[in-house]
């Protein structure tokens, strides 16, 4: 703190502001009377230097002219960037005890002259907003620097307003308040920036402009569409717009896309037909205005509209799959199952779905209608029937589809040949095969049908399928696929009457099982064991299970176990093996195998044979 | 009732300094925009400075650099400083009060709503 400088004064030459790199003479005198009270030349003035509050120097080396007892001259060079304090002391060097006592001070500032302003860009935002420029004002001058923004305009006039910068605030925009009015869209006007502080100033160079350049238009407003007779693809979509809009820009896209449609309009007075709309689908719109053709600036976009278009009749073919199983000798259960439309294909929330079933011959005729993607029904073995499916929104029906019911696995001669399935990843399977050898008629199609081999999967799951055109011979399977899990996988080819299959199991990843299987019983029939066993629990097989392994070997034995490696068949649960000695008493167990490896052995079992050997 | 009065005008040798004043009743000075215009005899009333509600002055290039307008919103008073003096500049200085944001309509008298009686500036070369 500095006492109101009571005891003396400090002057500044040349003066208290000065540019980076000169020097300052700082001089200190004490007023009349004031001093040490015993001896005047006793009186030592010292010059302390502060910045952030904090001494930094004692300038007691930096005098170069000094009235003893009376005023002292400092001389201080390379100050820094801002504002350096002086405060000059007055040390009584007699009293070794008293502290100096503080004289007055003054504050130096250190800068530079701004440097012209550059880069000025003025906006008006709406035709009833204000004008705002901004500009870059160069370098930090360190300084008070005060701005002036001068806009000139038609009829002689000029507009001014000022803003500064220090070390407290930044001036490098300016908000004039005042608005440019449309009457005046063929005006020119000038605006300048001026920057003034204690060691110099300077003037941007002037840029020039028209109303039409600067005048953002506000964003459009109160967006809403009208659908044409409830139309799900045609619809006007109309806004509110300032006056002097000439040219609209026009986005949308459903809601789930990543690329918007555009459209240009011009001169469209808030309202715009859209013809290409995709029925039952939530879309966005947005625009954007522009107050000249060629000149001036976009608006922001204006606020989302997000609308769902109205449903319209679905279109497309619902893909039909079917399972035949006779029930009895007159009976068979017909399940026919098809897949959901595509949103671009339903076009509205499908209500139901109308299935028939026709007898060809006798003309009769089932009929209904379900919500589900499935149907079953129990008919007569006999005759040629054929199947329709076709789906219904709130706006009308699909085309119905139809698929004759044949015999699907009936004619070996239509069975491909050289089926195989290989896993390409974690989700998918690769299945290819050859056309069949002997056909008695053209194949139309293929259909790879598949389902997990787990228990009550036929009757609990629905199957998957693919429909391949008669010229390809393989399928990338991927639905419902899950690595680890073994699938039946059916190769069907279809005529116009007759259907042949050829069968395989796939995994799209696979492990060593977790377990081996369980041994359940070993019975002796006519000099050959049959080991019998339970299957390995679905979720412990982890892919498909190649083959089963018997080991056996005489208890107490350290040989290595002789073994018996079985084809896997799921219907299969017991093997005959024929090679053990009588009287002998066995250890037996099993592994199963698959493409990754062999399971660890299922539960030990001891048997002693006691007929014949062989 | 909104009343706005001028004070300050007089006699003035060319080259000489003014300062007119405007006090205003019934509204607040900072929320319109001020304005100065002056008519000179057998001429029309014509435009002279403005300061807008946000503190941008507008001023006719003709008096730019001897002219300037100031607000003092404690006073409710607006103030026209006039520095070289020409005997050109001799007319009746009318304050003028009105809510404007255009930067024409800052110069047009007809968007101005209050208007003082005038106080009177003369210049002898």
């Known amino acids: 703190n500095i006492d109101v400088c009571k005891l003396g004064t400090v002057t500044v030459q040349p003066a208290p502001v000065i540019p980076l790199g000169s020097a300052a003479n700082i001089s200190c005198s004490l007023n009349p009377k004031q001093g040490c009270s015993h001896y005047p030349s006793s009186n030592e003035l010292i010059l302390l230097k502060f910045v952030n509050d904090v001494l930094v120097e004692n300038l007691h080396g930096k005098k170069v002219h000094d009235h003893t007892g009376h005023s002292s001259t400092f001389q201080v060079t390379n100050l820094s960037l801002g504002m350096t304090l002086f405060v000059c002391k007055l040390n009584c060097s007699n009293s070794q005890k008293k502290p100096p006592v503080p004289v007055c001070g003054v504050e130096i500032s250190v800068g530079v002259a701004p440097e012209p302003p550059q880069n000025i860009s003025c906006v008006q935002e709406g035709e009833n907003g204000t004008v705002a420029c901004s500009w870059n004002s160069g370098k930090v001058t360190y300084l008070k620097t005060n701005y002036t923004l001068q806009l000139s305009g038609p009829n002689n006039l000029t507009c001014q307003k000022q803003c500064f910068s220090d070390n407290r605030q930044n001036c490098n925009r300016l908000d004039l308040g005042i608005n440019l009015s449309p009457d005046l869209a063929e005006s020119r006007f000038i605006v300048r920036v001026t920057a003034i502080n204690d060691l110099g100033n300077s003037s941007s160079l002037p840029h020039t402009f028209t109303f039409l350049d600067i005048v953002i238009p506000l964003p459009p407003w109160d967006i809403r569409i009208n659908f044409l007779n409830a139309s799900g693809s045609r619809g006007t979509l109309q806004w509110e717009d300032e006056g002097q809009v000439v040219l609209n820009q026009l986005r949308y896209q459903p809601l789930n896309s990543t690329s918007w449609n555009m459209v240009n309009a011009t001169n469209a007075k808030g309202k715009y037909d859209l013809r290409d709309l995709r029925p039952f689908t939530e879309y966005e719109f947005q625009i954007s205005s522009k107050l000249h053709l060629s000149g001036g600036s976009w608006s922001n976009w204006s606020e989302s509209l997000r609308t769902r278009t109205p449903e319209e009749e679905p279109v497309g073919i619902l893909d039909i799959w079917y399972m035949k199983q006779d029930i009895d000798y007159d009976r068979q259960q017909i399940s026919l199952f098809w897949k959901s439309l595509n949103p671009s294909e339903a076009r509205g929330k499908i209500l139901h779905y109308q299935v028939t079933l026709q007898e060809v011959t006798k003309k009769t005729t089932l009929q209904n209608t379900t919500r589900h993607t499935s149907w079953t029904r129990v008919i007569p073995r006999t005759g040629a029937w054929t199947a329709s499916v076709s789906a219904a929104n709130s706006k009308g029906a699909s085309a119905p589809t139809h698929i004759n019911i044949v015999d699907l696995c009936g004619t070996g001669l239509l069975a491909p040949h050289q089926v195989s399935a290989k896993s390409e990843n974690m989700d998918n399977i690769l299945v290819t095969w050859q056309p069949p050898k002997k056909a008695d008629s053209a194949v139309r199609e293929y259909i790879v049908e598949w389902r997990a081999l787990q228990p009550g999967s036929i009757t609990k799951f629905p199957p998957h399928w693919l429909r391949i055109p008669p010229d390809n011979m393989s399928a990338l399977i991927s639905e419902n696929i899950k690595p680890y899990i073994c699938y039946e996988i059916r190769v069907h080819a279809l005529s116009e009457s007759q259907g042949g299959c050829s069968s395989i199991r796939g995994d799209s990843k696979h492990k060593a099982p977790v377990s081996g299987p369980h041994i359940t019983a070993i019975t002796e029939k006519k000099e050959r064991l049959f080991i019998s066993w339970t299957h390995i629990p679905f979720p412990e097989q982890r892919g498909c299970i190649l083959h089963y392994r018997i080991y056996w070997k005489e208890r107490d034995s350290t040989a290595q176990p002789e073994l018996c490696e079985i084809q896997y068949r799921r219907s299969q649960n017991s093997h005959p093996i024929s090679s053990l000695q009588p009287r002998v008493t066995y250890v037996l167990w099993m592994t199963a195998v698959t493409a990754a490896g062999e399971s660890p052995q299922g539960n030990e079992r001891e048997f002693c044979p006691q007929g014949k050997a062989n | 009732q909104v009343q706005l009065q001028e004070s300050g005008g007089g006699s003035v040798q060319a080259g000489g300094s003014l300062r007119l004043s405007c006090a205003v009743s019934?509204?607040?000075?900072?929320?319109?925009?001020m304005g100065w215009f002056r008519q000179a005899p057998g001429k029309e009333r014509e435009f002279v400075v403005a300061?807008?509600?946000?503190?941008?002055?507008v001023y006719t290039n003709s008096v730019k650099g001897r002219i300037t307008i100031s607000r003092d919103n404690a006073k409710n008073a607006v103030y026209l400083q006039m520095n070289a003096l020409k005997p050109e500049d001799t007319a009746v200085y009318y304050c003028?009060?009105?809510?404007?944001?255009?930067?024409?309509?800052?110069?047009?008298?007809?968007?101005?709503?209050?208007w003082g009686q005038g106080t009177q500036v003369t210049v002898s070369s």
């Open positions: 003028s009060m009105g809510p404007i944001t255009t930067f024409q309509g800052l110069a047009r008298q007809n968007e101005y709503h209050y």
């Open positions: 019934g509204r607040t000075v900072s929320d319109y925009a």
């Open positions: 300061m807008s509600s946000s503190e941008t002055t």
